[in-house]
Each structure stands twice: as structure tokens, then as C-alpha cells.
Amino acid sequence: LIIGFGISGKHFITVTTFTSAGNIGEDGTLSCTFEPDIKLNGIVIQWLKEGIKGLVHEFKEGKDDLSQQHEMFRGRTAVFADQVVVGNASLRLKNVQLTDAGTYTCYIHTSKGKGNANLEYKTGAFSMPEINVDYNASSESLRCEAPRWFPQPTVAWASQVDQGANFSEVSNTSFELNSENVTMKVVSVLYNVTINNTYSCMIENDIAKATGDIKVTDSEVKRRSQLELLNSG
């Protein structure tokens, strides 16, 4: 969470941004809020990126002005125009690229004053893992797969019964480059699993952490997955 203050004569407004992460190839949002101003035509929103000449996006007089927009953002950005008057200057970013990572500035000018705040935007790839029983293996095995990760994550297995056990000797993890030559598919196989136990496959890089749980009993297989972004907010 970053709060910036701006001073315009005697006037300053608070601008707040949130550090966030973008998933390569998906659509993302760079969050920014400011003190509301009912005079829409008096609000100017400018998004800038460190090291880039030209603007990421500009919104003024109630509409976009993309005349100064940098080529790399062409056709990829939009503000939530109907939410500007209530203080939402967040930016939608289409088809997030690795090169979109960096420091952005959300600059606001309203009839109340000026203000700005920076945000750090990380880009990578992260996806939910899916664990299945691998019936093709010679012994009872679990296969954990996640389709898209970048940078290369670490993979670790854990068990509810054998808490603290090191499964690195009885597991095998591989990383397969996807067709766009950036993200990778993660596959990890855990061997010699026992029935009536809950196993967890944990995939983590510096952007996200994902966990897949599986419980295998005689009568059923229960699965659960979750994903959390790291260092956000």
C-alpha cells in the first residue's frame, strides 16, 4: 500500500496505490484511488511508467486522450470511466507482458488539487495446481500439474501424516517450456504414497504461491487448490 500526497498551492489530495502482480497473457489491473471529485471534467488521470517516454494512459475532460500514449500500450489500456468520479483511477491492462513489470506512477489532478503515488507492478505466470492419482505408475503415485509458471518455481510435497518429512527423494519434478517460450508447465510426481493420507503439492515463486491438496481413501478422492499472490497490497 502506497499513499502519496500532492500539493497545489494550498491544496493537496491523497492518492493511494496497491502493489500488484500481473499474470502474463491475461488481463490485469493497476490499482489507484484518490479523493472523489464530482466535477468529472476537472479530473485528469495520468499513468506513467518509469523508463518509458510517453504516457501509459491519460484520461481528462471525461474521456481518454491517448495522443501521447507509448506504442507498447496501444490498444491495451482503459480506466473504469464510470468510476472516476468516485475516486477510482485504476487502470485495466490487456494481455500482460513480461516487459510490463516496473514502477508506475498514478498522477491525479482535480479541482481539489494534485497528487500522485507509485506502484510496483510485478509480472510473471502463476496457475492453480491439479493433483491426480497416477494409475500408470508402477507404485501408487500422485501427479501434480500446473500449466503456467514464471519465473521457475520451487515445488515441495508435504503430508498430513508425516509432517516435516522430506519428500525430495521420492518425488520427481520437471519443467516444460510452453509454446510462447516464456512460461512453463510444472509437473511433479510423488511416489510410494499411502492411502488415507492428505498430501499437498506446493508451488512457489517470488510472485505467487499455490497449493494443491489431495486426500485418497478407499472410497473417494478429495481435492482442493488455492492460489495466493505474495507481497501484494
Epitope: L66, E71, G75, T77
Partner: antibody, heavy 120, light 107 residues
Framework: QLQLQESGPGLVKPSETLSLTCTVS??????????WGWIRQPPGKGLEWIGN???????YYNPSLKSRVTISVDTSKNQFSLKLSSVTAADTAVYYC????????????WGQGILVTVSS | EIVMTQSPATLSVSPGERATLSCRAS??????LAWYQQKPGQAPRLLIY???TRATGIPARFSGSGSGTEFTLTISSLQSEDFAVYYC?????????FGGGTKVEIK
């Protein structure tokens, strides 16, 4: 309501340059949230995006046509134009102009289209 | 470039019946997809954008769904004016590309 109208010659000789103009009425071409695009459709076939322009003059072209395409804008006349050089029979198509959202980038509305035949 | 594939090429449906049109992208386009309707001798008309948002003035019988690589346009109860060719278009990355179209004809 916003309307677009294509104009230009319906017949162009091979190796010459195809030139079309799109006139925008019922709204300003300087509306900030939109690009202005060209799309074509060969007879009985599908649609191909040619490229777009912003009112400030910045352009983006389909790489498959980039070496032959020029799109320009005249804000004083509320018009934008397409030039396609070194045409062949494969460029025979109905050419449409359309307003293109800056994002989302859907095309709406479209001009009625103009059939351009490349033939000697 | 992203290749858009539509199926079937032709769909024969009786008036009042449901029509389901498919569009597949060669790679994920998130929800950055639009659907258009084109009648003979006319320009295409925008029906859906953002994969599922109906354009202004489009009847509720038209609905879009899907994300990533698989998309569907559903016409819940075909009216006589709905018999036309339908195109999907991705605007996820340049160059924007269209599918080959699905012709919906009277059975």
C-alpha cells in the same frame, strides 16, 4: 448517431494504388476513446483487419500488409483514409471502415462497405 | 498471429430453436473476444464484446460465454431475422483476427 461512409474508386488496375476515404458523421473523429480502422472482406470469404489510426495520427498495421499500407487522418474534415499500394487481384474485396474501441477493441459501428475490384 | 477457428461452418436450425456456435482460439485470448452478425450485402454488426457483454440494442436471446480458448455464441430462440453469418474476433493481441464464420441457415 455515429455513421461512417466509405468512398473511392470501385476499380483499380494491378500494380496501382488503391485509395479510399471514410467520412465520419454524427460524432467527432477526435473522440478520445476510439481508434479508426479498416477491415476488408474478399468476395465470399472472411474478414481481415488491415489497421487503425488514432486522431493524433499514430497508426498500427497488420504485419501481413504493413509494407503496402498507409492510413492517414484529416481531423478538419472528420475523415480518415486508406492507401494500399502495388495491388493485385488478391486485393479485390469489400473494404469497410469502422470505429474501434481503444479497449475493449471491438468494431462498432461499421460503414456500409465499398467493393474494390482490381482488374486491368 | 492468433488463429480463430469457428465450427460448424454451416448450422441448419428451425425457427424457434436454439443455435449454438463455437469459436476456438489457437492460444488464450482471455475474454478479449467479440461476435458479429453479417447478412448478405450488409456490413457486420457487433453483437457481443468481452466474450459475454451484449452490445447496445442487441436482443437478450443472444448470449456469449467462454474465456481462454473456447467460446460460444448462443441464440436461444431463432427468429427469422437471425439467419445470417456469424464471426468471432479476438482483440487480445495484434493483429486482430477473425474466425472463418458460421452460416446459420433455415432448416
Amino acid at each position: 448517431q455515429l455513421q461512417l461512409q466509405e468512398s473511392g474508386p470501385g476499380l483499380v488496375k494491378p500494380s496501382e494504388t488503391l485509395s479510399l476515404t471514410c467520412t465520419v458523421s454524427g460524432g467527432s473523429i477526435k473522440s478520445g476513446s476510439y481508434y479508426w480502422g479498416w477491415i476488408r472482406q474478399p468476395p465470399g470469404k472472411g474478414l481481415e483487419w488491415i489497421g487503425n489510426i488514432y486522431y493524433s495520427g499514430s497508426t498500427y498495421y497488420n504485419p501481413s500488409l504493413k509494407s503496402r499500407v498507409t492510413i492517414s487522418v484529416d481531423t478538419s474534415k472528420n475523415q480518415f483514409s486508406l492507401k494500399l499500394s502495388s495491388v493485385t487481384a488478391a486485393d479485390t474485396a469489400v473494404y469497410y471502415c469502422a470505429r474501434e474501441g481503444s479497449y475493449p477493441n471491438q468494431f462498432d459501428p461499421w460503414g456500409q462497405g465499398i467493393l474494390v475490384t482490381v482488374s486491368s | 498471429e492468433i488463429v480463430m477457428t469457428q465450427s460448424p461452418a454451416t448450422l441448419s436450425v428451425s425457427p424457434g430453436e436454439r443455435a449454438t456456435l463455437s469459436c476456438r482460439a489457437s492460444q488464450s485470448v482471455s475474454s478479449n473476444l467479440a461476435w458479429y452478425q453479417q447478412k448478405p450485402g450488409q456490413a457486420p454488426r457487433l453483437l457481443i464484446y468481452g466474450a459475454s457483454t451484449r452490445a447496445t440494442g442487441i436482443p437478450a436471446r443472444f448470449s456469449g460465454s467462454g474465456s481462454g480458448t473456447e467460446f460460444t455464441l448462443t441464440i436461444s430462440s431463432l427468429q427469422s431475422e437471425d439467419f445470417a453469418v456469424y464471426y468471432c474476433q479476438q482483440y487480445h493481441s495484434f493483429p486482430f483476427t477473425f474466425g472463418g464464420g458460421t452460416k446459420v441457415e433455415i432448416k
